[in-house]
């Protein structure tokens, strides 16, 4: 038979020969021959390979550098890389999470729509009419204006997106 031009799934072609790929978590030591199967070895302690492969070296696990605000979210195995996330109050600057930045705060007049996570920043929204925020915060939502009526009071000073209303006593008509 003619030598192959393509091989089966999880195989690779070398020297007119189909050889089995190494399974995830293992690296290639020697190619197969017609008599001997591909020789593979497990990756070391801090290494991984996440696909069927013919790599002669395993990849190093990602290092979650605390100096960059990183910490380990999920420890790597021989088949998976380490997943980093950011310390409390910080979030990743990219999908690869190679460094962290402090969560942004929402300025007065804006409230937190979505609290930041290790991988996403704070999402702020302007306080709509009837709501206010008078602080710069990464957690505080817009608060509703105080309802003077329910306290049997009247509005003495209108609220804004940054300030609450000011309530005061009602002027009573003297008899």
């Amino acid at each position: 038979p003619e030598p192959p031009t393509a091989c089966r799934e999880k195989q690779y072609l070398i020297n007119s020969q189909c050889c089995s790929l190494c399974q995830p978590g293992q690296k290639l030591v020697s190619d197969c021959t017609e008599f001997t199967e591909t020789e593979c070895l497990p990756c070391g302690e801090s290494e991984f390979l996440d696909t069927w492969n013919r790599e002669t070296h395993c990849h190093q696990h990602k290092y979650c550098d605390p100096n960059l605000g990183l910490r380990v979210q999920q420890k790597g195995t021989s088949e998976t890389d380490t997943i980093c996330t950011c310390e409390e109050g910080w979030h990743c600057t990219s999908e690869a999470c190679e460094s962290c930045v402090l969560h942004r705060s929402c300025s007065p007049g804006f409230g937190v729509k979505q609290i930041a996570t290790g991988v996403s920043d704070t999402i702020c929204e302007p306080c709509p009419v009837g709501f206010f925020s008078n602080v710069s915060s990464a957690f505080e939502k817009c608060h509703p204006w105080t309802s003077c009526e329910t306290k049997d009071l009247v509005v003495q000073q209108a609220g804004t997106n940054k300030t609450d209303v000011v309530c005061g006593p009602q002027d009573r008509l003297r008899a």
Partner: antibody
């Protein structure tokens, strides 16, 4: 290490039967095609038969077709050669040999690398 | 079955080179054939030396010295076993082997004498 050990040889009369066995060790027997090759006294090598790694196919040399049957038991890591209607010209040392692995493209069309020490079959009246 | 043709004997001196031929009959193209070579010493089973298909597709047997190499002579439709730096322990019978029509065929063998 890789080892093939043949057994079952002996002296037998023409027309009788004999079954040879070959015990394999040191490798994944079920991954390899296996052959029987014989060598008459003072003569060259003659191929007898091959069986695929999974037993799905067998081929035979012209001189033994219809009389000899190659088989294998992968659970016992053992290769067999059932020899019927033996003839004087079947007298030879019979070698069990390892063929190509199943990972090959058409792996059964590859050669043989490991040989046993052989077992002697003498057919004589 | 078509048996490859090998010269029955060959003599050479220690340190010299020897070229053993395995001629295929017409109809079997040496160019596309895998040719296997085996060495057999008296009282021992054959040992796999090498398989040669082309310079980019060859296989050396485990522990076989690089003094043993394969080649082909397309014009003679023959496979070649080349042994350089002959040593006394190279004295043995040498067999070539091919697949043809779903059967294995061995050459008749060459007896190499190292004088």
């Amino acid at each position: 290490q890789v080892q093939l050990v043949e057994s079952g040889g002996g002296v037998v009369q023409p027309g009788r039967s004999l079954r040879l066995s070959c015990a394999a060790s040191g490798f994944t027997f079920s991954s390899h095609g296996m052959h029987w090759v014989r060598q008459p006294p003072g003569k060259g090598l003659e191929w007898v038969a091959v069986i695929w790694y999974d037993g799905s196919n067998e081929y035979y040399g012209d001189s033994v077709k219809g009389r000899f049957t190659i088989s294998r038991d992968n659970s016992k890591n053992t290769l067999y050669l059932q020899m019927n209607s033996l003839r004087v010209e079947d007298t030879a040392v019979y070698y069990c040999t390892r063929g190509g692995g199943h990972w090959n493209y058409e792996g059964h069309y590859y050669g043989m690398d490991v040989w046993g020490q052989g077992t002697t079959v003498t057919v004589s009246s | 079955q078509a048996v490859p043709t090998q010269p029955s004997s060959l003599s050479a001196s220690p340190g010299a080179s020897a070229s053993l031929t395995c001629t295929l009959r017409s109809g079997i193209n040496v160019g596309s054939s895998r040719i296997y070579w085996y060495q057999q010493k008296p009282g021992s089973p054959p040992q796999f030396l090498l398989r040669y298909t082309s310079d980019s597709d060859k296989l050396q047997g485990s522990g076989v010295p690089s003094r043993f190499s394969g080649s082909k002579d397309a014009s003679a439709n023959a496979g070649l076993l080349l042994i350089s730096g002959l040593q006394s322990e190279d004295e043995a019978d040498y067999y070539c082997m091919i697949w043809h029509s779903s059967a294995v065929v061995f050459g008749g063998g060459t007896k190499l004498t190292v004088l």
